[in-house]
């Protein structure tokens, strides 16, 4: 090999030992039956060499660097060449690095052609191994800019009083340009200026100065982005860290073309701005530290840019002003992560705050739009409390559990809608009334409506879940004892065309023992199935809970147990079930841990069952399913 | 709900010291700074500075170096300031609030009911 | 330190009535100002964060607006519980100072 490097030119080549290998046998730079480790070349110098192995690219890295001096005569702008030409030189790993020293009144900027680049993280490399290095100086101190790839949207960094770019190139690529130009630019008043270009959907993640360390202290860095007119941005900060400042505090500006507040000022904790069509400013501005315990500044960040979708311009007015106790959020479903570009689904407050999701809260109107390519990827869930304080004023007082159409209006889909029923303890009590009989869901009868109703305690320490119950059965009121929630939980979006059988009204009335008692008002022409509280985890020790069912005059009801013991196991106490006639009062009383249960019975008036359970041991709980059906009465027994 | 629970009244004699909680409930007490502010009749209302558990430390106003000290412990969710070297002019109404992020740089969002202190011989 | 000067410093007004009560700091503090009403005997209650925005749960009759230098406080239709000493505060920059207070007392 031969390296020639011209007077003047600034140029210094080293060749050097990369990182060791555990390659057993050694490799040297052969100049004249020398053998060396390390040769410099220096401007106006010529060497000639060669390698002592077959693959020095496996021991030996190559760096070439020029000096560009523009403090003492004009600045060389333009097209930066690769110099020596890559064809000169070994096939090693070479880091070509130009450091381009100016005044502090001159702005230079960088420009790259395409394709972009695209800033990786600590610890990230690039695909192709082809990396730029871009520093910057402060009076003497040396700053990172940051470390980026090929194929990204930064098309120009602007710096002043100078800029020091390494360009790193694995040994077997082809790359014989720079890729890049300099041209000086009026001072830019700040560390630097990154230009960042969409020509489309996408995004880009960016960091501040010297990421993971701290940003300069006092410093002021700007990223523009250009945005094409008819898409939409929005930033979300991925990472950051606050120093210890001394007065004024670190801040981020947005300047956004068209707003009303240039430039909009938020502190790093804030929600930023979404929904910005076209171009803008983000600027990040440090603080003064304190001296004893500075701390650090730092900021990852990302863009998306996406189409707006239909819905980005509408605005939806959602009135809680005489709402009370009520908070509405709007969220992200569940999903399985993709790893394929996936546009961003927004909600946004006042058109410009956006997140992915958005708590409203009663007392106030709110206007909210969204930015979002498929609504069905969010949802809503809503919470209210309905409290009772004074049990003389609430006693018999009645309240509407239906989902306003303010929130029925939205074109996001309604998961659940909760409503917490709060009572005086050992003073009230609660009846639910649905507008339509409910039907209990079963794995014999399961709910196919669009929604149920899941009922549940509302007592933190009481694990109690009454049931899930849908439209179209046979109960006709549910009464509990104490604080409860219920929950509207919608199954499909035909929920929007079903949402006229919703309708459950609440009354407090007085207090009473039992943890629940049903209604149940069977029609001739179905089975009802019902089933304890808490299914599946076994009814509360030491809880009772009754059905009192109704018989028409003309029918006969049928009651079947779907086994044949009830499996509790008693660790203190009894369990017990008593059914009774409404009529006689005559009742029959079955031990549910020791009697085998009732055979099939048939009731010809109105009866109760009741059921208390013990404290069962662990493991063996209270479980019951049973069925009632009523047929016509053959014989007239009255 | 959140709350933030401030200790009672205080009579102390002029040149003593005394400590202040406050108590924060129904929230992450961590995630959350705590400012303390007071209330007198001379100088309405007053920053004395904030305690940031999320960035571990305190800021003062510089009228008040030396005169208040704010500690955390985090085992009981609880804020304190000491007031040292007292004179007749620290009797006033002393509130936490809080920060209404993990820094020190938000609005205060929720305040506790202030402490009452007296400052007399 | 920022000034925050705050009128006028008292007032009296009917119910239902429309109440503006300004802020001006001695500097532009990039809307970072919150206002908080203390009613007698109780703590101070935050309504209005960034200049304009209603903290949950706040009525909507009350309102915020102002930048740079100038903040306005708005309560559209007064209410009795709605009297108490109502304080702006400035979270631009350390430290934290506030206004001097505006009594609202029901005519």
């Known amino acids: 090999f031969e390296i020639a490097l011209p007077r003047e030119s600034n140029i210094t080549v080293l060749i050097k030992l990369g990182t060791p290998t555990l390659l057993a046998k050694p490799c040297y730079i052969v100049i004249s039956k020398r053998h060396i480790t390390m040769l410099s070349i220096k401007s106006g110098e010529r060497i000639v060499f060669t390698f002592s192995c077959q693959s020095p690219e496996n021991h030996f890295v190559i760096e070439i660097q020029k000096n560009i001096d523009c403090m003492s005569g004009p600045c060389p702008f333009g097209e930066v060449q690769l110099q020596p030409s890559t064809s000169l030189l070994p096939t090693l790993n070479r880091t070509f690095i130009w450091d381009v020293k100016a005044h502090k009144s001159i702005g230079l900027e960088l420009q790259f052609s395409i394709p972009r680049l695209r800033q990786i993280g600590p610890g990230e490399s690039c695909p192709d191994g082809v990396t730029h290095s871009i520093s910057g100086r402060i009076d003497a101190t040396v700053v990172r800019i940051g470390t980026f790839c090929s194929n990204g949207t930064v098309s120009r960094i602007k710096m002043q009083e100078g800029v020091k770019m390494a360009l790193h190139l694995p040994w077997f690529h082809p790359r014989n340009v720079s890729g890049f130009s300099i041209a000086n630019r009026s001072s830019i008043k700040r560390l630097c200026i990154i230009e960042s270009v969409f020509e489309g959907e996408g995004s880009a993640t960016l960091m501040s100065a010297n990421y993971p360390e701290g940003f300069p202290e006092d410093e002021l860095m700007t990223w523009q982005f250009v945005v094409p007119a008819h898409l939409r941005a929005s930033v979300s900060f991925l990472n950051f860290n606050l120093s210890n400042c001394e007065r004024k505090e670190e801040r981020v500006e947005y300047y956004i073309p068209g707003s009303t507040t240039n430039p909009e000022v938020f502190k790093l904790e804030d929600k930023q701005p979404g929904n910005m069509a076209g171009n803008f400013n983000l600027s990040l501005q440090g603080c003064d530290q304190d001296a004893q315990s500075p701390g650090i500044l730092r900021l990852q960040f990302q863009v998306l840019v996406q189409h707006p979708q239909n819905e980005s311009n509408k605005i939806y007015v959602v009135d809680l002003s005489n709402e009370r106790a009520m908070s509405l959020t709007i969220e992200p479903r569940p999903v399985k992560q993709s790893r394929k570009f996936v546009p961003g689904c927004f909600v946004c407050l006042e058109s410009r705050t956006c997140s992915s999701n958005l708590t409203l809260t009663s007392g106030s109107k709110h206007k909210i739009s969204f930015l979002c390519d498929d609504l069905t990827r969010l949802w809503m869930n809503v919470e209210k409390t309905i409290s009772c304080t004074d049990h003389r004023y609430c006693q018999r007082k009645s309240y509407s559990l239906q989902v306003p159409s303010d929130i029925l209006h939205l074109p996001v889909e309604l998961h659940d809608f909760s409503w917490k029923l709060l009572v005086p303890k050992d003073r009230l009590s609660l009846v639910l009334v649905p507008a339509q009989k409910l039907q209990q869901h079963t794995h014999e009868k399961p709910c196919n409506t669009s929604f149920s109703y899941l009922v549940a305690s509302a007592i933190p320490s009481q694990d109690l879940y009454f049931g899930s119950f849908c439209p179209g059965g046979s109960i006709k009121q549910i009464q509990v004892k104490q604080n409860i929630s219920v929950t509207l939980r919608t199954f499909a979006p035909s929920f929007q065309q079903e949402a006229s059988r919703q309708g459950l009204t609440v009354s407090f009335i007085p207090y009473f023992k039992e943890e629940g008692v049903f209604t149940v008002t069977p029609d001739t022409k179905s089975k009802v199935y019902l089933r304890t509280p808490n299914w599946d985890r076994g009814l509360p020790s030491l809880t009772s809970v009754s059905w009192n069912i109704s018989v028409p005059r003309d029918q006969v009801a049928c009651l079947t147990f779907f086994k044949e013991r009830s499996g509790v196991v008693c660790q203190t106490g009894r369990a017990f079930m008593i059914i009774q006639e409404q009529r006689t009062r005559a009742e029959e009383i079955f031990s549910l841990d020791e009697d085998v249960l009732p055979k099939p019975s048939f009731h010809h008036h109105s009866f109760w069952v009741n059921i208390s359970n013990c404290s069962p041991t662990s493991g063996k709980q209270l479980d019951l399913l049973f069925s009632v059906t009523l047929t016509p009465r053959t014989v007239d027994l009255t | 709900q959140v709350q933030l629970q401030q200790s009672g009244p205080d009579l102390v004699r002029p040149g003593e010291s005394v400590k202040i909680s406050c108590k924060g409930s129904?929230?992450?007490?961590?995630?959350?700074?705590i400012h303390w502010v007071r209330q007198s009749h001379a100088k309405s209302l007053e920053w004395i500075g904030v305690?940031?558990?999320?960035?571990?430390?305190?800021k003062y106003n510089q009228n008040f170096k030396g005169k208040a000290t704010m500690t955390v412990d985090k085992s009981s969710n609880t804020a304190y300031m000491e007031l040292a070297r007292l004179t007749s002019e620290d009797s006033a109404i002393y509130y936490c609030?809080?920060?209404?992020?993990?820094?020190?740089?938000?609005?205060?969002?929720?305040w506790g009911q202030g402490t009452t202190l007296t400052v007399s011989s | 330190d920022i000034r925050m000067t705050q009128s006028p410093s008292s007032m009296y007004a009917s119910l239902g009535e429309r109440v503006t009560i300004t802020c001006k700091a001695s500097q532009d503090i990039n809307r970072f100002l919150s206002w908080f009403l203390q009613r007698p005997g109780k703590a101070p209650k935050t309504l209005i964060y960034r200049a304009n925005n209603l903290v949950e749960g706040v009525p909507s009759r009350f309102s915020g607006s102002g930048s740079g230098q100038d903040y306005s406080l708005i309560i559209s239709n007064l209410e009795y519980e709605d009297m108490g000493i109502y304080y702006c505060?400035?979270?631009?920059?350390?430290?934290?100072?506030f206004g001097g207070g505006t009594k609202l007392e029901i005519k």
């Open positions: 305690i940031s558990f999320s960035y571990d430390n305190t």
């Open positions: 505060l400035q979270y631009d920059e350390f430290p934290r100072t």
């Open positions: 609030a809080r920060d209404c992020y993990g820094s020190n740089r938000g609005y205060f969002d929720y």
């Open positions: 129904g929230y992450t007490f961590t995630d959350h700074a």
